[in-house]
């Protein structure tokens, strides 16, 4: 089974770029119907520091014992998201000559969807999670990997891209987020803040976390991933929480403690062969699904993003390390490489379990506002 | 027309260098992984280096650290430049590009080349 | 380093023949494999990239299947033109030294 395909003709008008500067496009929001954090203020117009909230403004949120003593995200308080203040600076680009997807960067020129039009899609992704909002969808099966416990050789190429730390990935590993719906991974690659700012694409219920990590497949229906681009279910992401744990995490040990080799933009290391599915939560089974796009120029649309319910715990000092270490281009840090959450535009997110039942003594019945369009397959 | 040309092969004696060249017309490279192949005569063909679309660069063992590979996008084209050269490097040399737009920011594999170079023949003899 | 063990290195056959091809990885590919065809004094010819996918223009008597370690170039009636030299190259990484290799070659000659 599928994720459905969005409708052309969803409730909301258009979508929104996530960059800096407000498009001229008639079909896309307006200051009044999106939120300030799905449509960020322009560099010119950022608020200063002293009008952004503290850490001490942010809810507390303290993570169970169970599991790994990993947070659960339907666990996190209901709160009303003021706008996000965590914009992404104006620091992580790639300038490479003849390569116009290349000339991009966070925050600032040249707006996204003058580097690709489809950043300025209805689809968009990162996108805020409400879990109360997700339809549960009991055919949402447990996620299945296979080979991502890879040996030490060959190693396996680290590299800073100016806009993020990536691992590609050899063949062999192979994904299903259910029957008939195969992916081979093909690499992976995080994204962070800074000191006291979080980094994290998506965010639930507007708590953004530290960081992220995404690990992209490719449809075994495609050869090649220009062939899978914009094709609905071409490529899907696996997404997942980082944040701060009292341990030390020794799978990403294994990639942190590489990052001062690279910490130049375009320089790249060789790692021994890790279990990369050590990099996930444990809990393949309680996930949202929904389609949407890469986060990144081209944008491509048709990108299906399981975002695991599970989070996974790093320590204080490995999120230091990894917000704190590269650089990207010229004398920029690395940093705040996160795009601004997008415009559902109509669609739902799906949930593997029950996410939006309100465990309160008050609630009498349990409250799901959207049905799983997908429960007949 | 896509294609792909190979120019700066020769005689050179061992020890030498050559700098091959392989420009590309129809198309800019800029965007795709390309490769070097040799074929030694009577031989079969031998994989040389390749460079992806971010310019970064990976070898044969039986060249690594005596030839760099190189990309210019403003002028379209690839090169090959091959020091210390010895005996068992003379071969016709081709260079060729990958089937389609490479993404290696995507962790994008090759899986076939096309088009490919008609060839230039480089020969190691004192 | 990977290495592509193909076989045979030679064989013969006459015009309608069925020939088969095959190339073996020394760790999986996955479908990251593709088959040429050489004639004397010319450049490679792309025949099968994707381990099963017939290139632009090539006769559909050619097909190619297998994934993992394990592949196989089939002409299914054998013409004049088809007789050369046929290479696979198997890529398992290009973002490490000696992540590609190429066959050995299979001559394919006129009984």
């Known amino acids: 089974q599928r994720l459905p395909r969005m409708q052309e003709d969803s409730p909301l008008g258009g979508g929104s770029s996530g960059e800096d500067d407000p498009l001229g496009e008639e079909d896309l929001p307006s200051e009044e119907d999106s939120p300030r954090e799905e449509d960020p203020p322009g560099e010119e117009d950022l608020p200063g520091e002293e009008d952004l909230p503290g850490e001490e403004d942010l809810p507390e949120v303290k993570p169970k014992s169970e599991e790994e003593g990993s947070l659960k995200l339907e666990d996190l308080p209901t709160v009303e998201a003021p706008g996000d203040p965590q914009e992404p600076q104006n620091n992580a680009h790639r300038d490479k000559e003849g390569d116009d997807q290349s000339h991009w960067r966070y925050g600032g020129d040249p707006p996204w969807p003058r580097v690709s039009p489809a950043c300025a899609g209805r689809f968009q992704s990162p996108v805020d999670i409400r879990p109360q909002l997700a339809a549960f969808c009991p055919a949402l099966r447990p996620l299945e990997l296979l080979g991502f416990q890879l040996p030490p050789l060959p190693e396996l190429r680290l590299r800073n891209n100016g806009h993020s730390v990536q691992l590609t990935l050899p063949p062999g590993l192979e994904m299903a987020l259910g029957p008939g719906r195969e992916y081979r991974a093909l690499q992976l690659h995080l994204h962070w803040g800074a000191a006291g700012r979080p980094g994290s694409e998506h965010t639930v219920e507007g708590h953004r976390f530290p960081a992220e990590i995404h690990v992209v497949h490719l449809s075994t229906a495609f050869a090649r991933v220009d062939e899978a681009l914009g094709r609905p279910g071409g490529l899907a992401v696996l997404a997942a929480f980082l944040e701060e744990g009292p341990e030390e995490n020794s799978a990403y040990e294994q990639l942190l403690s590489r990052l001062e080799e690279i910490a130049e933009e375009g320089s790249e290391t060789q790692v021994p062969g890790l279990d990369i599915s050590a990099l996930l939560p444990s809990d393949f089974s309680r996930y949202f699904q929904y389609e949407g796009s890469l986060t990144t120029p081209p944008c491509a649309q048709g990108v299906i993003w399981t975002v695991f319910n599970q989070t996974v715990m790093l320590s204080a000092k490995q999120l230091h390390t990894l917000s704190d270490t590269l650089w990207g281009p010229g004398d920029s840090r690395l940093q705040l490489n996160f795009r601004a959450t997008q415009p559902l535009n109509g669609r739902v997110i799906e949930a593997s379990f029950p996410a939006g039942v309100d465990s309160s003594p008050r609630a009498a019945e349990p409250v799901q506002l959207n049905s799983c369009l997908a429960a007949g397959d | 027309e896509v294609q792909l040309v190979e120019s700066g092969g020769g005689l050179v004696q061992p020890g030498g260098s050559l700098r091959l060249s392989c420009a590309a017309s129809?198309?800019?490279?800029?965007?795709?992984?390309l490769i070097w192949v040799r074929q030694a005569p009577g031989k079969g063909l031998e994989w040389v280096s390749i460079?992806?679309?971010?310019?970064?660069?990976y070898y044969a063992d039986s060249v690594k650290g005596r030839f760099t590979i190189s990309r210019d996008n403003a002028k379209n084209s690839l090169y090959l430049q091959m020091n210390s050269l010895r005996a068992e490097d003379t071969a016709v040399y081709y260079c060729?590009?990958?089937?389609?737009?490479?993404?290696?920011?995507?962790?994008?594999?090759?899986?076939?080349?096309?088009?490919w170079g008609q060839g230039t023949l480089v020969t190691v003899s004192s | 380093d990977i290495q592509m063990t193909q076989s045979p290195s030679s064989l013969s056959a006459s015009v309608g023949d069925r020939v088969t091809i095959t190339c073996q990885a020394s760790?999986?590919?996955?479908?990251?494999l593709s088959w040429y065809q050489q004639k004397p004094g010319k450049a490679p010819k792309l025949l099968i990239y994707?381990?099963?996918k017939l290139a632009s223009g090539v006769p559909s008597r050619f097909s190619g299947s297998g994934s993992g370690t394990d592949f196989t170039l089939t002409i299914s009636s054998l013409q004049c033109e088809d007789f050369a030299t046929y290479y696979c190259?198997?890529?398992?990484?290009?973002?490490?030294?000696?992540?590609?290799?190429f066959g050995g070659g299979t001559k394919v000659e006129i009984k």
């Open positions: 190259l198997g890529v398992y990484s290009i973002s490490t030294d000696d992540g590609a290799a």
């Open positions: 760790q999986s590919i996955s479908n990251y």
């Open positions: 129809g198309f800019s490279l800029s965007r795709y992984t």
């Open positions: 994707a381990a099963s």
């Open positions: 460079i992806d679309s971010s310019s970064s660069a």
């Open positions: 060729a590009r990958d089937r389609v737009l490479s993404y290696d920011d995507y962790g994008d594999l090759p899986d076939g080349f096309d088009p």
